[in-house]
């Protein structure tokens, strides 16, 4: 035999201060007749919550029309909800009687619970950058949430992270509740345009978490690799001369050119490139002049990047038999 | 006046979702007091029920459907649709589309669709 | 689910003949019943809401009777467009459900 089902499907709805609550509450039957009523806490102390028929209830909207003889949708929406609303409601069906309705049956309950959003996650990265294959330390944290059941999952690029650790405050009850998690992420030559990414999911964001991020470009120093060739072209008495430092961030970056040991003060002409990694390249050229008496010139570029020690390499300039003769023909 | 156009593919292959939508036109879907019906009839045979959508978003489903059956509206468009997933053989049938009126029988239909389930 | 029993299944009778159909509900269901009528090749229509109530632009020689577990549609004199099956419908519990269809003819 079929009977009445009072279906109310959220066994905890979380609200925010101020906001609406949508209490639902179906019924599988349109048997016995009879109306159907609401109420807050059960025995006889239970509060009347909505009427349809008689009473006076400001804050209560039904989602329905109850006065479809056919509606099965008993659902209703409380406004401008405070903390004094939480509590468990229920919806009750009574027979329709004389003298008056008798409760028929009534719905399992919902548990009204105020809810608080966390807050934006915030990521911090270290203080200092750190080189390739290196670990790293990210830490994220979000404040104000409400319950305490939160869930943090850390991503690189899109990939998830599993070295992390997380702690959520305080441990026993609250009004509000904190998290911190703190991710090690081992650095690759090509992160600079990396992103780590601190998601956060709570019940009150409905599924669409919260998201908070940090660029690798601000933790991760490439250091540059430098090659110093002699261009097997001359211009007339001088020959061209290139360092390349190749494949460095930032950008930051001083180059100098020595000539046996005595730092070189005139003009050079440079290059500077961006790769697709985000990294840089940098072309500097050093015209040396060739005459008789220089007969062995050591030329050394040096590179001082991001403040760390300077780095150089040196190239012992070949000039030929016939570049000097050539040079001294054509000195008068 | 208030008439309802069912639309959808003809032809589902087995273990697809059917996927159909019922136009409104000449009257709102969002007013009040309308409930939104899909029924269903297999080739030769009777009228099977398939679920409601109330103006307010409620849905009820017939309990032999209940976990392949989706209903939703779309206020926007003035549309309500009908998915139904896993389908087979036994999903091959002529799907209408109609509406509740405010006492209680479904006081208007759309023509219906036919929909087979064929690979 | 509420059982709907239809009967007959189908039936013949002349124009101007009182026809009578019955539906009985596998419990009572009060009078939250509707009646139906498809043409074939076309939609239902309905005829009858609420057991007796009928509906808009519907011809009076339609009626409906019956309250709990037994109901009646009858159609008090034949006529050529009436061709079609007749449904019964209950909307008391969930799922709806509708009887397995009544198919008039003509002699």
């Known amino acids: 035999e079929e009977e009445l089902q009072m279906i109310q499907p959220e066994k905890l709805l979380l609200v925010t201060v101020g906001k609406t609550a949508t209490l639902h509450c179906t019924v599988t039957s349109l048997l016995p007749v009879g109306p159907v009523l609401w109420f807050r806490g059960v025995g006889p102390g239970r509060e009347l919550i909505y009427n349809q028929k008689e009473g006076h209830f400001p804050r209560v909207t039904t989602v329905s029309d109850l006065t479809k003889r056919n509606n099965m949708d008993f659902s209703i929406r409380i406004s401008s909800i405070t903390p004094a609303d939480v509590g468990t409601y229920y919806c009750v069906k009574f027979r329709k009687g004389s003298p008056e309705n008798v409760e028929f049956k009534s719905g399992p309950g919902t548990e009204m619970a105020l809810g608080a959003k966390p807050s934006a996650p915030v990521v911090l990265g270290p203080a200092a950058r750190t080189t390739p294959e290196h670990t790293v330390s990210f830490t994220c944290e979000s404040h104000g949430f409400s319950p305490r059941d939160i869930t943090l999952k850390w991503f690189k690029n899109g990939n998830e992270l599993s070295d992390f650790q997380t702690n959520v405050d305080p441990t026993g009850q609250s009004v509000a509740y904190s998290i911190r998690s703190t991710a090690r992420v081992v650095l690759d030559p090509w992160d600079v345009r990396s992103q780590v990414i601190c998601e956060v999911a709570h019940v009150t964001l409905q599924g669409d978490p919260l998201r908070g991020t940090a660029n690798l470009s601000e933790a991760i120093r490439v250091p540059p690799t430098l090659e110093v060739t002699q261009q097997p072209m001359r211009v007339g008495n001088q020959v061209n001369v290139t360092c390349q430092v190749r494949k460095f961030y930032p950008q930051s970056l001083q180059l100098t050119w020595s000539e046996n040991g005595n730092v070189c003060q005139r003009e050079t002409a440079s290059t500077l490139t961006e790769n697709k990694d985000g990294t840089y390249n940098w072309t500097s050229w050093f015209l040396v002049n060739i005459s008789d008496q220089r007969d062995d010139v050591v030329l050394t570029c040096q590179v001082k990047h991001d403040g760390q020690l300077a780095v150089s390499k040196r190239l012992a300039l070949e000039v030929t038999v016939h570049q000097k003769d050539q040079s001294s023909d054509a000195t008068p | 006046q208030v008439q309802l156009q069912e639309s959808g593919p003809g032809l589902v292959k087995p273990s697809q979702t059917l996927s159909l939508t019922c136009t409104v036109s000449?009257?709102?879907?969002?007013?009040g007091g309308w409930y939104w019906q899909w029924i269903r009839q297999h080739p030769g045979k009777g009228l099977e029920?398939?679920?409601?959508?109330?103006?307010?978003?409620?849905?009820f489903y017939n309990p032999s459907l209940k976990s392949r059956v989706t209903i939703s509206v779309d206020t926007s468009k003035n549309q309500f649709s009908l998915k139904l997933s896993s389908v087979t053989a036994a999903d091959t049938a002529v799907y209408y589309c109609?509406?509740?009126?405010?006492?209680?029988?479904?006081?208007?239909w759309g023509q219906g669709t036919t929909v087979t389930v064929s690979s | 689910d509420i059982q709907m029993t239809q009967s007959p299944s189908s039936l013949s009778a002349s124009v101007g003949d009182r026809v009578t159909i019955t539906c009985q509900a596998s419990?009572?269901?009060?009078?939250?019943l509707n009646w139906y009528q498809q043409k074939p090749g076309k939609a239902p229509k309905l005829l009858i809401y609420d057991a007796s109530n009928l509906a808009t632009g519907v011809p009076s020689r339609f009626s409906g009777s019956g309250s709990g577990t037994d109901f009646t549609f009858t159609i008090s004199s034949l006529q050529p467009e009436d061709i079609a099956t007749y449904y019964c419908q209950q909307f008391a519990y969930l799922p709806w459900t509708f009887g397995g269809g009544t198919k008039v003819e003509i002699k």
């Open positions: 000449g009257g709102s879907i969002s007013s």
């Open positions: 109609a509406r509740e009126g405010y006492h209680s029988g479904m006081d208007v």
């Open positions: 419990q009572d269901i009060s009078n939250y």
């Open positions: 029920w398939i679920g409601t959508i109330y103006y307010s978003g409620s849905t």
